[in-house]
Amino acid sequence: APVRSLNCTLRDSQQKSLVMSGPYELKALHLQGQDMEQQVVFSMSFVQGEESNDKIPVALGLKEKNLYLSCVLKDDKPTLQLESVDPKNYPKKKMEKRFVFNKIEINNKLEFESAQFPNWYISTSQAENMPVFLGGTKGGQDITDFTMQFVSS
């Protein structure tokens, strides 16, 4: 079966939207009205990976772009990046682990844990207009909870 994907936008628990900041970075900020059109649309693909009770492995691509969120070590620290891929080969069922996130969905709140680096989560800062990053703490200052809005294909 082909990989099933859905199109969606994500907002953090403070209702900040995610937008492109340069070619390979996302940032989070509050948007209103027509500015909402700036927010990135993700193609969330359901991929094969380790599953546990409340975790569903997904890959997060940018819709109609050959870019995927991935987790790599930079200066010995797990880091979130946007990585360019060959669109002929992606998405695929068995994505490389750096592209895989464990989607944890409880009461309409979502967390995205890195499969490559357990207990590291896609995070945003409390401050406006800051990069989306991979954070190693949950429940602290940084925000790891998101809501998902479906976008029709």
């Epitope: 099933r4 359901f46 997904v58 069922k93």
Partner: antibody, heavy 120, light 111 residues
Framework: QVTLRESGPALVKPTQTLTLTCTFS??????????VSWIRQPPGKALEWLAL???????YYTTSLKTRLTISKDTSKNQVVLTMTNMDPVDTATYYC????????????WGQGTVVTVSS | QSVLTQPPSVSEAPRQRVTISCSGS????????VNWYQQLPGKAPKLLIY???LLSSGVSDRFSGSKSGTSASLAISGLQSEDEADYYC???????????FGGGTKLTVLG
Amino acid sequence: QVTLRESGPALVKPTQTLTLTCTFSGFSLSTSGMWVSWIRQPPGKALEWLALIDWGDDKYYTTSLKTRLTISKDTSKNQVVLTMTNMDPVDTATYYCARMREGSRAFDIWGQGTVVTVSS
Amino acid sequence: QSVLTQPPSVSEAPRQRVTISCSGSSSNIGDNAVNWYQQLPGKAPKLLIYNDDLLSSGVSDRFSGSKSGTSASLAISGLQSEDEADYYCAAWDDSLNGPVFGGGTKLTVLG
């Protein structure tokens, strides 16, 4: 803790319609990537997949029984219902519901099953 | 007749290793994940292996799965009497647009 429980009549007459309910807890069928399925097993025989419903209300049926089966969900009640029309003695089986997840498409948690006998 | 083909039965002595084969086609095993289930007598099936070779939570590492082309196999090492059960392989089938099961293999632990 994820659990699923099947309920429905133990005995149905030939030509009647069977209605089975799967009541689950510990997960939500509104969670993207979740599915619930029905599978049956006639006495002494192999497992046979019947129907699937996913978080987005997409429905899938086994080809041989497609015209007789209807699957539906009530997300607020955490229930999935299967109806099977025109029951026949060969439909006598243990009927299971199970959770499935997109990705592996594995039935990771099963109910205990309910035995349905078709006899006049 | 089942879409996936398994031997009806296998038997082996305690503490030995046994493998159960599962043969399919390009529309199922060839292009989709293989999952294995154990069904103890009178019980509901239980997931053992998913995504070809990943061990389900709480399952003994005496169980392992592998896949090559359109065939898969389940291996059980250090056989114990409590392993006596029916074992089923399954995979999504793209042609049928749904999951398919093997006919099941009855494992007997001798002695």
